[in-house]
């Protein structure tokens, strides 16, 4: 029959500066039942405020809605752990929205392949941003990231699109069954969880080129140019 | 009220087993536990472990690991201390004590075993 | 372990007296720190618990107070029924652990 452990709050994640939950993990178990609460204030401000809600974040978690969030200010908040033997307190975090963003997957990839009749194949895929982020506003920069690799493949091939939401790639193995997938990450903040993968059946009939690929680039405003495997790696992330 | 009633004094041999039970009333016993602390004849309180009636948790001391049990029964409410290879040197008071609202707020009467060949 | 060292082992006093008992850990114990009484053939009582709040029915003449380490227990005005061993006891970590107890005599 112990107090509780130190928890210790350890994860804040905002989807779209508008709303944001905080997460915690409970210190050693005391062997009896433990209750938790969260309180905050506004750096700055001395009033301390409990968590506005439990239960939307799941279980250790305090959510934060719309009318709970300020932008430009940092949050002070710990959590209290107390069975009848005593409290815990978690040490104090500091959380300011901006730089804990990380938006929903982005949403829609498709994913095709064409095959113009004067130049290579190759797969384009396009994607649209998570709804929950307004881009119109200026607020957020989104950068993005795809990765494939063919079915039965370990190793997962990744290439970096800057603010795009298209992309095109040269280069993959004919006959083969790809998926593909990408993530988004605010200028400042996490990247998201990748999409749902969506597969590609290559055309056994696709064109092989090692030495070229050819992709989008962003300053090209989605025209396309042949690049090499060298300057290739300056896109490239594995 | 809360009350914590542990059973008659008990006479053993060296090597036998004991087995001293703690029987709880006046609360919700499956959201504590049981924890027994012995006291030596002119000595102070020694705290032996305890049996979590919430969860079955057990946190012993180390120098009874070996052989003692503890446990909780919460159909009976009724805390168990089972101490087997006894030596002269667990001829003790034993009590019970237990969380109702605050640390260690109700014990038992007390249990003297007393061994002896 | 974490150590508990009371001090006096056994003090005197009048009725009326005010008398402090302390008790030092040999680490910090986050203020988990009980006391007891108790008197010749009979359980300990709780008196204080997290170093300085008292358990329901006991009187105000006691007081608990300290932190991290250092501890003491304060009787404002001794009563004969207050000739008895205290103990301290810390429960921040497993085993738990008693100090060796302060016996108040009456002078």
């Known amino acids: 029959q112990l107090p509780p452990g130190k928890p210790e709050i350890f994860k804040c994640r905002s989807p779209n500066k508008e709303t944001f939950t905080c997460w915690w993990r409970p210190g050693t178990d005391g062997g009896l039942p433990t209750n938790y609460s969260l309180t905050y204030h506004r750096e700055g401000e001395t009033l301390m405020h409990e968590c506005p809600d439990y239960i939307t974040g799941g279980p250790n978690s305090c959510h934060f809605g719309k009318q709970y969030t300020s932008m430009w200010r940092t949050y002070v908040m710990m959590v209290n752990a107390t069975n009848q033997m005593g409290s815990s307190f978690s040490d104090e975090l500091y959380v300011d929205v901006t730089y804990i963003v990380q938006p929903d997957p982005p949403l829609e990839l498709t994913v095709e392949v064409k095959q113009p009749e004067d130049r290579k194949p190759y797969l384009w895929m396009k994607w649209s941003p998570p709804t929950l982020i307004d881009l119109k506003t200026g607020w957020f920069t989104l950068l993005y990231e795809i990765r494939l690799k063919p079915e039965k493949a370990a190793e997962w091939e990744t290439h970096f699109a800057g603010q795009q939401t298209e992309f095109k790639i040269l280069s993959l193995h004919p006959g083969q069954k790809y998926l593909v997938q990408v993530r988004c990450k605010p200028d400042h903040g996490y990247w998201s969880a990748w999409s749902p993968a969506t597969f590609i059946q290559i055309p056994s009939d696709f064109i092989m080129n090692d030495e070229q690929k050819l992709i989008s680039e962003e300053d090209l405003g989605g025209e396309q140019k042949l690049i090499s495997e060298e300057d290739l790696h300056h896109h490239h992330h594995h | 009220q809360v009350q914590l009633v542990q059973s008659g004094a008990e006479v053993k041999k060296p090597g036998a087993s004991v087995k001293v039970s703690c029987k709880a009333s006046?609360?919700?016993?499956?959201?504590?536990?049981i924890t027994w602390v012995r006291q030596a004849p002119g000595q102070g309180l020694e705290w032996m472990g305890w049996s979590s009636a919430y969860n079955g948790k057990t946190d012993y001391a180390q120098k009874f690991q070996d052989r003692v049990t503890m446990t909780t029964d919460t159909s009976t409410t009724t805390g168990y201390m089972e101490m087997r290879s006894l030596t002269s040197d667990d001829t003790a008071v034993y009590y019970c004590t237990t969380v109702v609202r605050r640390p260690f707020d109700f014990w038992g009467q007390g249990t003297l075993v007393t061994v002896s060949s | 372990d974490i150590q508990m060292t009371q001090s006096p082992s056994s003090l005197s006093a009048s009725v009326g007296d005010r008398v402090t008992i302390t008790c030092r850990a040999s680490q910090d114990i986050n203020n988990f720190l009980a006391w007891f009484q108790q008197k010749p053939g009979k359980a300990p009582k709780s008196l204080i618990y997290a170093a300085s709040s008292l358990q329901s029915g006991v009187p105000s003449k006691f007081s608990g107070g300290g932190s991290g380490t250092d501890f003491a227990l304060t009787i404002s005005s001794l009563q004969p029924e207050d000739f008895a061993t205290y103990y301290c006891q810390q429960y921040s970590s497993y085993p738990i652990t008693f100090g060796q107890g302060t016996r108040l005599e009456i002078k």
């Open positions: 006046g609360y919700t016993f499956g959201t504590s536990g």
